[in-house]
């Protein structure tokens, strides 16, 4: 069948999800495309526990996540509700800063060197994390 019962090679399993950590950079949209081509999505952080797991693997490096406000409100790429969900912004972030001189504000979220989140110019070539959930069907206990 098409169910994903275990993580692909070079992906890391954690709490019924699979994670892939890039070692090169891409703009946010290109990173998003990359994850989709892996039948995955940019990482969606839903808990402090998941935040710590991702932070441990990426180290002190700017890294894209699946959160953006390119169309107005902040949205997670998998539809997870932003308003009621987990957040870990740096103080005074997001600030949609226009002072970078690159045109426009800051519409894409990334992990900073201390793991807390910042909004930044989506064209910056940061590393990224892909995530895909193991299929619910595979989580059911086997029939005896």
């Amino acid at each position: 069948g098409s169910e994903r019962t275990c993580c692909p090679v070079n992906w890391v399993e954690h709490e019924r999800s699979c994670y892939w950590f890039s070692r090169s950079g891409k703009a946010w949209a290109d990173a998003d495309n990359y994850c989709r081509l892996e039948d995955a999505h940019l990482v969606v952080v839903t808990s402090w526990e998941e935040q710590k797991f991702v932070q441990h693997h990426i180290g002190p490096v700017n890294t894209w996540m699946g959160l953006h406000d390119q169309n107005g409100p902040w949205k997670w790429v998998d539809g997870t509700d932003y308003e009621t969900g987990f957040k870990n912004w740096r103080p005074e972030q997001p600030d949609d800063w226009y002072g970078h001189g690159l045109g426009g504000g800051e519409d894409c979220a990334h992990f900073t060197d201390d793991g807390r989140w910042n909004d930044d110019v989506c064209q910056r070539p940061y590393r990224w994390v892909c995530e895909t959930e193991l299929d619910k069907a595979s989580q059911e206990p086997p029939l005896l």
């Epitope: 994903r4 692909p8 090169s24 891409k26 290109d30 495309n33 990359y34 989709r36 081509l37 039948d39």
Partner: antibody
Framework: EVQLLESGGGLVQPGGSLRLSCAAS????????MSWVRQAPGKGLEWVSV????????YYADSVKGRFTISRDNSKNTLYLQMNSLRAEDTAVYYC???????????WGQGTMVTVSS | DIQMTQSPSSVSVSVGDRVTITCRAS??????LAWYQQRPGKAPKLLIY???SLESGVPSRFSGSGSGTDFTLTISSLQPEDFATYYC?????????FGPGTKVDIK
């Protein structure tokens, strides 16, 4: 042995349709994104389309968008390219290729020739 | 779209010569670059990925370098089977694009 084998090429009139197939063997087909790349006679390589391993995501070159459709049948280990509204400039050898995590193509088929002419 | 250029477009060399082919991207692509060899009437063959990583089974006389916009493929000592056309490909963003190719032929 890892292998890709294209078929389905031929002569077709402008405005016509053709479906190319690519039979894969020797690797876990549904674990890899697959692509089509073409080469017009005496010209360079042009990327056409790519599809994710489970078929949920596709991307196309602007030159074929809306006319070509990439698909796959993982139960048959086969990749397809449905080509509609064909034009003379679509004349080329069409290769299927296996994508790597670095977005390069490490395995290529032998190619199938598509000629669009009246 | 990202445009890829290659130079030279062709080069005539002798067996044993060192050959250097350059590839330039119209914008920064980090190390998202691959090199291919294509012999007449054959499918392309992957030589280098991620700008400098040698594909399994490819002879060590092939090497790649560069990052950002400027990249180089080097063949340290050309062998008879290396006479072919070489293409670079950017893998940074869709649509993936190839350089126009560099033909390496016998002097």
């Amino acid at each position: 042995e890892v292998q890709l084998l294209e078929s389905g090429g031929g002569l077709v009139q402008p405005g016509g349709s053709l479906r190319l197939s690519c039979a894969a063997s020797g690797f876990t087909f549904n674990s890899y994104a697959m692509s089509w790349v073409r080469q017009a006679p005496g010209k360079g390589l042009e990327w056409v389309s790519v599809i994710s391993g489970r078929g949920g995501t596709t991307y196309y070159a602007d030159s074929v968008k809306g006319r070509f459709t990439i698909s796959r049948d993982n139960s048959k280990n086969t990749l397809y390219l449905q080509m509609n509204s064909l034009r003379a400039e679509d004349t080329a050898v069409y290769y299927c290729a296996k994508r790597t995590p670095s977005d390069a193509f490490d395995i290529w088929g032998q190619g199938t020739m598509v000629t669009v002419s009246s | 779209d990202i445009q890829m250029t290659q130079s030279p477009s062709s080069v005539s060399v002798s067996v044993g010569d060192r050959v250097t082919i350059t590839c330039r991207a119209s914008q920064d692509i980090s190390d998202w670059l691959a090199w291919y060899q294509q012999r007449p009437g054959k499918a392309p063959k992957l030589l280098i990925y991620a700008a400098s990583s040698l594909e399994s089974g490819v002879p060590s006389r092939f090497s790649g370098s560069g990052s950002g916009t400027d990249f180089t493929l080097t063949i340290s000592s050309l062998q008879p089977e290396d006479f072919a056309t070489y293409y670079c490909q950017q893998a940074n963003s869709f649509p993936f694009t190839f350089g126009p190719g560099t033909k390496v032929d016998i002097k």
